[in-house]
């Protein structure tokens, strides 16, 4: 019987109850490999999930997330709520990024602005909740007598500490 079962292709299961060994996977089920004793029930893309690829006799359904949510985990096993740029998702919902941090996506966490001074550079463009700072030439490059084609960095807004 084992040898006969190995002849059953994807889309079938090896049916011990019948002389006709390879039976079709019934509706809403599939087998993606040959020689299966049972067919797996198709994944249902319901609620916050929507169908990206419908289930067939030989492959499972694939889900995406509905608008306003994004996939997490292998094969989109979870859907997480989107936030706006400049926000992060907390247990209490979407919250604005704290001062000194930013998030340029609808998902993920707020990350600290780049510390330009660590690379010996100065802040060329200030950071916002949605965007990281842009680092420019080092202050030494901008000292009198230094030849540079780069214009001097704009004055920082009050309250923005040097990076």
């Amino acid at each position: 019987l084992q040898d006969l079962c190995s002849n059953c292709p994807a889309g079938t299961f090896c049916d011990n109850n019948r002389s006709q060994i390879c039976s079709p996977c019934p509706p809403n089920s599939f087998s993606s490999a040959g020689g299966q004793r049972t067919c797996d029930i198709c994944r249902q893309c319901k609620g916050v999930f929507k169908t990206r690829k419908e289930c067939s006799s030989t492959s499972n359904a694939e889900c995406d997330c509905i608008s306003g949510y994004h996939c997490l985990g292998a094969e989109c096993s979870m859907c997480e709520q989107d936030c706006k740029q400049g926000q992060e998702l907390t247990k209490k919902g979407c919250k604005d990024c704290c001062f000194g941090t930013f998030n340029d996506q609808k998902r993920g966490i707020c990350r600290p602005w780049t510390n330009c001074s660590l690379d010996g550079k100065s802040v060329l463009v200030n950071g916002t909740k949605e965007r990281d700072v842009v680092c420019g030439p080092s202050p030494a490059d901008l000292s009198p007598g230094a030849s540079s084609a780069t214009p001097p960095a704009p004055a920082r807004e009050p309250g923005h500490s040097p990076q």
Partner: antibody
Framework: QVQLQQSGAELMKPGASVKISCKAT????????LEWIKQRPGHGLEWIGE????????NYNEKFKGKATFTANTSSNTAYMQLSSLTSEDSAVYYC??????????WGQGTLVTVSA | DVLMTQTPLSLPVSLGDQASISCRSS???????????LEWYLQKPGQSPKLLIY???NRFSGVPDRFSGSGSGTDFTLKISRVEAEDLGVYYC?????????FGGGTKLEIK
């Protein structure tokens, strides 16, 4: 969207054979079981059998073994059913249908086969 | 073979009425996987049959919610809560749990 387009009506002589086609569009043809159904006036609907085009595996209702033969061409996305040794009992409308959430989730428009001397 | 018996053979109704069609199988139609593959189809004159209900009680996409299916074991029912003109035709039950898969003889829904 899923569509099954069947070949046109056939007028056949007793003892002859006929090959009906079912062209599939709108889905991955090789991955779904395709079913065949017979409908005769006064006899209702009868399941003939099925084929999985990707592997060519087919199953038949015992009643139609030796009468119907299923084949499929995955390059043209077309399934075929050949009916042999035709008699007046084979005069019917034949449908192809695709498995989905049910055994016959999507149907072709049907092919009328008339067997007459 | 599993015999599927539908009653009544003909069902005259007035538009807006409720209609109920019974389907009885000659044996239990639970599949080896535990599911019951009992389906209902509607065939309008000159058309192919169309799927209405699958696995006893699930409405197929696009099927109005006035259609409902119920039952278990060997006794199944299709109900139409308020019959509309577009519902007229022949209704078939079908079992796909045992080979050969078999249809009921049909119930013709017609105007009284």
């Amino acid at each position: 969207q899923v569509q099954l387009q069947q070949s046109g009506a056939e007028l056949m002589k007793p003892g002859a054979s006929v090959k009906i086609s079912c062209k599939a569009t709108g889905y991955t043809f090789s991955s779904y079981w395709l079913e065949w159904i017979k409908q005769r006036p006064g006899h209702g609907l009868e399941w003939i059998g099925e084929i999985l085009p990707g592997s060519g595996v087919s199953n038949y209702n015992e009643k139609f073994k030796g009468k119907a033969t299923f084949t499929a061409n995955t390059s043209s996305n077309t399934a075929y059913m050949q009916l042999s040794s035709l008699t007046s009992e084979d005069s019917a409308v034949y449908y192809c249908a695709r498995l989905g959430l049910a055994w016959f989730a999507y149907w072709g428009q049907g092919t009328l086969v008339t067997v007459s001397a | 073979d599993v015999l599927m018996t539908q009653t009544p053979l003909s069902l005259p109704v007035s538009l807006g009425d409720q209609a109920s069609i019974s389907c009885r199988s000659s044996q239990n139609i639970v599949h080896g996987n535990g599911n019951t593959y009992l389906e209902w189809y509607l065939q309008k004159p000159g058309q192919s049959p169309k799927l209405l209900i699958y696995q006893v009680s699930n409405r197929f996409s696009g099927v109005p919610d006035r259609f409902s299916g119920s039952g278990s074991g060997t006794d199944f029912t299709l109900k139409i809560s308020r019959v509309e003109a577009e519902d007229l035709g022949v209704y078939y039950c079908f079992q796909g749990s045992h080979v050969p898969r078999t249809f009921g003889g049909g119930t013709k829904l017609e105007i009284k």
